[in-house]
């Protein structure tokens, strides 16, 4: 808390500029008008203020906007955003994607902080759903974002947003999350032609039921082992040896290297040895 002192003669700031870096903390408090700061927030980032000085500027904004900052100020916070607490951010009403991008840019290259998580939560709740543009933006900054959401939160993702999802965005998703995303992906891609459809849906197949895998096994898809290893164990277990052979096509030989890992291990144990022997891979049930 900075003590209230009168501004020395001739030091009253008429604009936010580089001369302010030479002000002591108490001088910033006394000589910078909060309303001026709010209207010239975009200049703050161009000035090499110390962290202590930024604390003073934040304090001034807090006094001016006790109920939370307006979006016109939030959009230009820049590095001052790093000074905000989740409690501060919960008071905000962020509706512009440009504002969100500007603040995510400040945190770029770092782990998702509690501040960023709160900001995203406020933004998405304000929009009512995770639309395509938002998802596009969030996964560009945080590829693991989608998989950080609960299945309940994912259920509010509209199928149209699935077009923004890249394979790497799903790398850390667990089966419960893919169970929610797979039907949305099916809906999103349902009008694509065959080979293009399979390329798009492949990343989501960890949520596919047995009947879809059976159907795909009859259509020369040549699923790679990496995709097969991410399938739900309960969806793979009912597949016959012939179906798995057709599903994987030339990649079936890769089963040998994965025979000790799920779901391959559990699937092998469900098959008759005679059927496994038809693969010629030396798999032991």
């Amino acid at each position: 808390e900075v003590e209230k002192t009168a501004c020395p003669s001739g030091k009253k700031a008429r604009e936010i500029d580089e001369s302010l870096i030479f002000y002591k903390k108490w001088e910033l408090e006394a000589c910078v008008d909060a309303a001026l700061l709010a209207t010239q927030m975009d200049r703050v980032n161009a000035i090499p203020f110390t962290y202590e000085q930024l604390d003073v500027l934040k304090h001034k904004l807090d006094e001016l906007y006790p109920q939370g900052y307006p979006e016109s100020v939030i959009q230009h916070l820049g590095y001052l955003f790093l000074k905000m607490s989740p409690e501060d951010i919960r008071k905000w009403n962020v509706t512009s994607l440009e504002t969100l991008k500007a603040l995510l840019e400040v945190n770029k290259g770092h782990e998702m902080s509690p501040q960023v998580a709160t900001l995203i939560d406020r933004f998405v709740k304000g929009r009512g759903q995770l639309d395509k543009d938002t998802l596009d933006t969030l996964t560009a900054f945080y590829p693991g974002y989608l998989c950080s959401l609960s299945p309940e939160e994912l259920s509010s993702v509209p199928p149209s947003s699935i077009w923004a999802v890249r394979p790497q965005d799903l790398d850390t998703c667990d089966p419960r999350q893919l169970d929610v995303l797979y039907p949305k992906a099916r809906l999103a891609f349902q009008n694509m032609n065959g080979s293009e459809y399979f390329v798009k849906i492949q990343s989501f197949l960890g949520g596919a039921p047995t009947e879809d895998l059976k159907a795909l096994s009859q259509q020369n898809v040549s699923m790679d082992l990496a995709t097969f290893m991410k399938l739900r164990t309960d969806a793979v277990l009912p597949l016959t040896v012939a179906e798995v052979q057709k599903l994987l096509g030339p990649h079936v030989e890769g089963l040998k290297a994965e025979e000790r890992h799920r779901p391959v291990r559990d699937w092998i144990l469900r098959q008759r040895q005679d059927d496994l022997d038809t693969l010629g891979l030396g798999l032991q049930g």
């Epitope: 039907p183 009008n191 399979f198 009947e211 879809d212 159907a215 009859q218 259509q219």
Partner: nanobody, 128 residues
Framework: QVRLVESGGGSVQAGGSLRLSCAAS????????MGWFRQAPGKEREGVAS????????NYADSVRGRFTISQDNAKNTLYLQMNSLKPEDTAMYYC?????????????????????WGQGTQVTVSS
């Protein structure tokens, strides 16, 4: 997952008509196939007609072409089989089935081994 329930079967005189319905519950997508199949006592299950849910493709067995019409109501997730000019040899248990993922329309041909989801069936009896 898709569950299928048939209705509309019954007994009819030769030359008469029946309309079978199949209600699909669960997720129905455009890139799915739905079809009608039948099995007479002591015979193998055979394809009657099929349709690509996304539209633009129907397929009929030679024995029913021109007499039977397959159609769908996407809003109600319901498949229909309008059967006209029925013959005694049409007597069978009629099944509705689905292929949950079809990468091409052509894959929707009414070949029983391709279909992964089946209803319980509805009996059609045609007397001469």
């Amino acid at each position: 997952q898709v569950r299928l329930v048939e209705s509309g079967g019954g007994s009819v005189q030769a030359g008469g008509s029946l309309r079978l319905s199949c209600a699909a519950s669960g997720n129905v997508y455009n890139n799915m196939c739905m079809g009608w199949f039948r099995q007479a006592p002591g015979k193998e299950r055979e394809g009657v007609a099929s349709i690509y849910v996304g539209g633009g493709y129907t397929n009929y067995a030679d024995s029913v072409r021109g007499r039977f019409t397959i159609s769908q109501d996407n809003a109600k997730n319901t498949l229909y089989l309008q059967m006209n000019s029925l013959k005694p040899e049409d007597t069978a248990m009629y099944y509705c089935a689905a292929i949950t993922v079809a990468l091409t329309r052509a894959f929707c041909a009414p070949i029983p081994s391709r279909y992964t989801n089946w209803g319980q069936g509805t009996q059609v009896t045609v007397s001469s």
